[in-house]
């Protein structure tokens, strides 16, 4: 179980790196973030560390109310601050693992 979670964490972070470059990856991550109401791997600040992402933005799928451009120059109160690895991991533990 721990190995699966560790793999999921690594994979999620790897996909974050590809987010700006790959539309398919972006749509998968967007779906996960929107569905699970989460942002980033550990938390939303992970997006700040992606070199090809602008420092003042997160994907729109992180927004509580998703609209085009809502992740630009974001306010913390307008986005999901919790990380996806923990949130989705909890769901996996409960329903799959």
């Amino acid at each position: 179980r721990d190995k699966v979670m560790s793999e999921f964490n690594n994979n999620f972070r790897q996909q974050m790196e590809n987010y700006p470059k790959n539309n398919h990856t972006a749509s998968i991550l967007d779906r996960m973030q929107a569905d699970f109401k989460c942002c980033g791997a550990a938390n939303y600040t992970d997006w700040e560390k992606i070199p090809s992402m602008s420092k003042n933005r997160v994907p729109d799928s992180c927004c509580i109310n998703v609209t085009v451009g809502c992740g630009i120059n974001f306010n913390e109160k307008a986005i999901h601050k919790e990380g996806c690895v923990e949130k989705i991991g909890g769901w996996l533990r409960k329903n799959v693992l």
Epitope: N43, T45, E48, S54, K55, N56, G69, C70, I72, N73, F74, N75, E76, K77, A78
Partner: antibody, heavy 119, light 108 residues
Framework: QVQLVESGGGLVKPGGSLRLSCAAS????????MNWIRQAPGKGLEWVSY????????YQADSVKGRFTISRDNAKNSLYLQMNSLRADDTAVYYC????????????WGQGTLVTVSS | DIQMTQSPSSLSASVGDRVTITCRAS??????LNWYQQKPGKAPRLLIY???SLQSGVPSRFSGGGSGTDFTLTISSLQPEDFATYYC??????????FGQGTRLEIK
């Protein structure tokens, strides 16, 4: 009503330090990013630093990087700017500025506090 | 970094005149453009946000336009209290947040 009151400015020698404070009232402090913006005498506006609602995100202008540190105390509704290794070109009025983010602009500014760096 | 260039840097006008100040960004900033008014010895005041939205309490003679890289601030009929310095500012790509160099509006 919204109020931002800066304090801590004054005359300091080059290489010295100063800590600016900003007391915020009349709004929910944690709903906003906060900024320091400065204006040298007779010059334009220059962004110095911002900090996110929780304090998790902080950025400084290149001109002050490694010398100035922004912080906030949400329990005290206060914003701070620790300024070290001050130089003559840091002489300016420093404004504490509220930032709703997105495309809304800097909607409230303090009255400013003057920092003079001179020997 | 995104550079903001205002023109003109100063202009003289009379009460009742229609005045337009322009601001150009070095790359597209969509509509993340704000305008401020500053009077001597005072803090700046937000006039227009999101390129064209009037901030609460600002007279309707002020209007903003544009998107992408080119923006305008228009004062339809100058009043004595409008003589001041005006700044544009972008928040689309930051840090750093950048301002134009300012436009000083003087009485002719």
């Amino acid at each position: 009503q919204v109020q931002l009151v800066e304090s801590g400015g004054g005359l300091v020698k080059p290489g010295g330090s100063l800590r600016l404070s900003c007391a915020a009232s009349g709004f929910t402090f944690t709903d906003y990013f906060m900024n320091w913006i400065r204006q040298a005498p007779g010059k334009g506006l220059e962004w110095v630093s911002y900090i996110s609602n929780s304090g998790a995100i902080k950025y400084q202008a290149d001109s002050v990087k490694g010398r100035f540190t922004i912080s906030r105390d949400n329990a005290k509704n206060s914003l701070y700017l620790q300024m070290n290794s001050l130089r003559a070109d840091d002489t300016a009025v420093y404004y504490c500025v509220r930032d709703p983010r997105s495309y809304y602009g800097f909607d409230y500014w303090g009255q400013g506090t003057l920092v003079t760096v001179s020997s | 970094d995104i550079q903001m260039t205002q023109s003109p840097s100063s202009l003289s006008a009379s009460v009742g005149d229609r005045v337009t100040i322009t601001c150009r960004a070095s790359q597209s900033i969509r509509n993340f453009l704000n305008w401020y008014q500053q009077k001597p010895g005072k803090a700046p005041r937000l006039l227009i946000y999101a390129a064209s939205s009037l901030q609460s309490g600002v007279p309707s003679r002020f209007s903003g336009g544009g998107s992408g890289t080119d923006f305008t601030l228009t004062i339809s009929s100058l009043q004595p209290e409008d003589f001041a310095t005006y700044y544009c500012q972008q928040s689309y790509s930051n840090p750093p947040i950048t301002f134009g160099q300012g436009t000083r509006l003087e009485i002719k």
